[in-house]
């Protein structure tokens, strides 16, 4: 399995009360506003044929999509949450900047890209849904980088 | 086939530990958490915690902080869960189960260990 | 007590069609999975992210969600069906697994 190094968050990231409430507040926010329920982005189909240590990576790939082609466009609704939110979110994003996989990570690529393609068809319900699911990103990074 | 297999019954007196194996077998032991969940008699399901086998690290029901520690042996790819302090009411059916992301249903769940504690 | 409430009990006559519900609150964000236990039995995952079925559970179960109930439907029920059934969702707020009472179906 390709070796991934610089792919670690330290737990207290994840132990801020204020911040991840604030997380939770926006992807519930989101999700009343999301009317697709049959479709799901973060799941087992994200994780497939991917190994525990290759995860972090994975939801870098994950967190870097959802901060730039999600949440920066989208950055003028849901508030207050989003001005609080996208800020922490960018400061794990930074964290992770040195996270890289030594070897082949096409499958990786792979799910990405079907998440990806997902979010871009469903056009702006799509990325509606991500919002939604921003507390399944947050727990995904956490079991993951930790 | 993908199952997980675990340890026998046992009987323990109050105060006394136990510790439940569960061994994995037809997948890879790392690439899926493994949850801990018992059953009083009678009762309904109760999560316990999980332990990720690929880095040791664990996440435990407020309950049972204190008195449970989940571990792994990577190399028999076997999980364990060790409950302390034992009371009566810890008399339950003991499974594990896997899953995927450490928050997702569980597919795959052991066949069970009843431990009774009593003087 | 469960923050997931289920009926204790539901009972349906053979062939006939059996709904069991699972209500909590703050649903809307949360997966809701279903299990299957018969007695002396380890529980089996019948109904999985609300409503997909994993491989070998009969099409017969199917799950479904409105606004903060989830529901587990049973059509052509069987005898074989009798069981207790749990739902179940990640509470992502206390980081923990919680279940529901649990439904006993009996079929008649």
């Known amino acids: 399995a390709p070796i991934s190094s610089h792919c670690r968050l330290d737990k207290s990231n994840f132990q801020q009360p204020y911040i991840t409430n604030r997380t939770f507040m926006l992807a519930k926010e989101a999700s009343l506003a999301d009317n697709n329920t049959d479709v799901r982005l973060i799941g087992e189909k994200l994780f497939h044929g991917v190994s525990m240590s290759e995860r972090c990576y994975l939801m870098k790939q994950v967190l870097n999509f959802t901060l730039e082609e999600v949440l920066f466009p989208q950055s003028d609704r849901f508030q207050p949450y989003m001005q609080e939110v996208v800020p922490f979110l960018a400061r794990l994003s930074n964290r992770l900047s040195t996270c890289h996989i030594e070897g082949d990570d096409l499958h990786i690529q792979r799910n990405v890209q079907k998440l990806k393609d997902t979010v871009k068809k469903l056009g702006e319900s799509g990325e509606i849904k991500a919002i939604g699911e921003l507390d399944l990103l947050f727990m995904s990074l956490r079991n993951a980088c930790i | 086939q993908v199952q997980l297999v675990q340890s026998g019954a046992e009987v323990k007196k109050p105060g006394a530990s136990v510790k439940v194996s569960c061994k994995a077998s037809g997948y890879t032991f790392s690439d899926y958490y493994i949850h801990w969940v018992r059953q009083a008699p009678g009762q309904g399901l109760e999560w316990m915690g999980w332990?990720?086998?690929?880095?040791?690290?664990?996440r435990y029901a407020q309950k049972f902080q204190g008195r449970v520690t989940m571990t792994r042996d990577m190399s028999i790819s076997t999980a364990y869960m060790e409950l302390s302090r034992l009371r009566s009411d810890d008399t339950a059916v003991y499974y594990c189960?896997?899953?995927?992301?450490?928050?997702?249903?569980?597919?795959?769940w052991g066949q069970g260990t009843l431990v009774t504690v009593s003087s | 007590s469960s923050v997931l409430t289920q009926p204790p009990s539901v009972s349906v006559a053979p062939g006939k069609t059996a709904r069991i519900t699972c209500g909590g609150n703050n649903f809307r964000n949360k997966r809701v999975h279903w299990y299957q236990q018969k007695p002396g039995q380890a529980p089996v995952l019948v109904i999985y992210?609300?409503?997909d079925r994993p491989s070998g559970i009969p099409e017969r179960f199917s799950g479904s969600r409105s606004g903060n109930t989830a529901t587990l439907t049973i059509s052509r029920v069987e005898a074989g069906d009798e069981a207790d059934y749990y739902c179940q969702v990640w509470d992502f707020l206390t980081d923990s697994g919680s279940f529901g009472g649990g439904t006993k179906l009996t079929v008649l």
């Open positions: 332990v990720n086998p690929d880095t040791g690290g664990t």
């Open positions: 189960a896997r899953d995927l992301t450490g928050f997702d249903p569980f597919d795959i």
């Open positions: 992210y609300d409503s």
